[in-house]
Amino acid sequence: QECTKFKVSSCRECIESGPGCTWCQKLNFTGPGDPDSIRCDTRPQLLMRGCAADDIMDPTSLAETQEDHNGGQKQLSPQKVTLYLRPGQAAAFNVTFRRAKGYPIDLYYLMDLSYSMLDDLRNVKKLGGDLLRALNEITESGRIGFGSFVDKTVLPFVNTHPDKLRNPCPNKEKECQPPFAFRHVLKLTNNSNQFQTEVGKQLISGNLDAPEGGLDAMMQVAACPEEIGWRNVTRLLVFATDDGFHFAGDGKLGAILTPNDGRCHLEDNLYKRSNEFDYPSVGQLAHKLAENNIQPIFAVTSRMVKTYEKLTEIIPKSAVGELSEDSSNVVHLIKNAYNKLSSRVFLDHNALPDTLKVTYDSFCSNGVTHRNQPRGDCDGVQINVPITFQVKVTATECIQEQSFVIRALGFTDIVTVQVLPQCECRCRDQSRDRSLCHGKGFLECGICRCDTGYIGKNCECQTQGRSSQELEGSCRKDNNSIICSGLGDCVCGQCLCHTSDVPGKLIYGQYCECDTINCERYNGQVCGGPGRGLCFCGKCRCHPGFEGSACQCERTTEGCLNPRRVECSGRGRCRCNVCECHSGYQLPLCQECPGCPSPCGKYISCAECLKFEKGPFGKNCSAACPGLQLSNNPVKGRTCKERDSEGCWVAYTLEQQDGMDRYLIYVDESRECVAGPN
């Protein structure tokens, strides 16, 4: 382990610096000029420097577990854990899950009542007795409830023509109820006759587009526990449909922009505000279902199985079953899905601050182990066969006292984890012996804490009427700086710079602001190494022949010289043997400027005056065209053809010379002058 510390002046600050840091409380462990921070290091380092093992303060993270034996059936143990967390050091504890037999079940049947589900509704109406019987095979306490959904009652989800709103079914003779988002029909009950009666009253409905508003309905089932009648038991939500689902964002199609708020909005058992709130997102719904321990079973027709399997990847503790076209197999489907769900255990925790990190090692009964996962996960869990999860909790800093909850998703049991900081050092109390602090202070973990009026490592400096701020002021570069730059002790108003344990590093300066190591590096060495330069107070001083902020350049311009030995062709400057070209000119030698505008138009008047002594510059040609030199022989370069002041075409060639705006110009003898009309 290592200990990376920054400006540590107390045992607590040391412990906060990292799990590898320990503190030596031994008296006189520091020598003159040594910072208190050298008391903070790894255990082997402190031992090596002569700190006795019992003088080393090294508090460790630990876990204390408590069982709560009151109350009924418990599937998770322990019920309470107290953790003392040292920053960076994990505390680990085991959680055992034992799946109980006959755990009570609440099952809410949520059904799509769009027109294509007509034959399914006929079968579900006869289902009450079978459903309860199936539940009673698994548990002694089963209850069933019923709700239905169609979609939001605005275009394009339903047809809003008044006739269609009254009867949305394609077959006018068919008795059919108006569309609705979600109706809670039957509160959870153990009375199968009541189920039969209430579901028997339900009429089919209809909507316009293929996807339905099922997520809206699921959100209400999860957000309205009192209205639905959920108990604190296994909660199953059977979602029966033959089509897909709308989700967050789809509401915009119907001008519904307000995000789903995840709250209960049932009035007279109807979700009447569905046209005010968008559909929930899948993540939002997954969170709400997990928060309320609801395990969805998607009973869907064959063509929709793949879609809903994708959904179960996002919603933990959910299952998919293939529903026959008329829902006749739904009881069998629910049984299978329940067995699948109850044999898979996810252990998870509620949201935590960034300062706490939790990981799980899952030791499953079938010999499978998953390590360092964000949640516990075991499949194939059998009744009464215990499985173990090791939970590791790490704090990144000294945390506030707080607690969080671990739960097995879909079950009601919880483990409450109380978290406390482990940051204090219980040093030997020597506060009574004041002699070591010149009688002017007391010892705390090997360091003198001075009385008012005294400062210094051993409280040896009397402030003499000057405030400690004044004394310390003369150890600061300015009001915004820290005392002795954090690299020395202010002894009676003067900086005593620390000695450094880094080889070759010397801390110096009136405020300990300078050192011989904190300079730019080149090739991994300060100032390129001793052969190139030396570091003085943050700046490299290069030896002759070298330059650059890290002495990285050999002082030569050879790579910048063009064939005429002109540096960067006069269109840039040489830095570190590389040209820095003026805007637009290209490396390596600033010879070409592909993006620069053509110089032709700029120099027509110069061509005119240099060759023909005419035009606007005729009288002061050399002053107006200082960068141009007329050549009597053809030159190579840019060929131009421009109209002069008399409207004649002049052809000329510009050959760029070294420097900016400097050209050799060759102008054709003849001009092309077009005679004007008579």
């Epitope: 790579g559 043997n577 590389v578 040209c579 290209q586 490396l587 390596p588 030698l589 010879q591 070409e592 592909p594």
Partner: nanobody, 116 residues
Framework: EVQLVESGGGLVQTGGSLRLSCAAS????????WGWYRQAPGKQRELVAV???????DYSDAVKGRFTISTVNAGNTVYLEMNSLKPEDTAVYYC??????????WGQGSQVTVSS
Amino acid sequence: EVQLVESGGGLVQTGGSLRLSCAASGSTFNINAWGWYRQAPGKQRELVAVISSSGSTDYSDAVKGRFTISTVNAGNTVYLEMNSLKPEDTAVYYCRAADSGPWRYWGQGSQVTVSS
């Protein structure tokens, strides 16, 4: 990375001719300038000819009119045609390339000796 290999150097009489060639391999598609440098014993290295990817050329006064720089093979080979050679042209000739930046790549050098 670009590798440059020169060839064509050798011993020649005053007034004679030689053609140096420099073959490039590797990521040559970015190269925007080629140069021929030379270094005579006890003297500084100097640039004698340069050609850009657009084809424009430039020469030092000492070789202007006698040496010609050119590229072929989609710019993967650069030549230096040296005519009317003089004893003062004796040097190690280096090919150099730049890829949208400073001179980055060097060849290993090719010895040219002009005897009187």
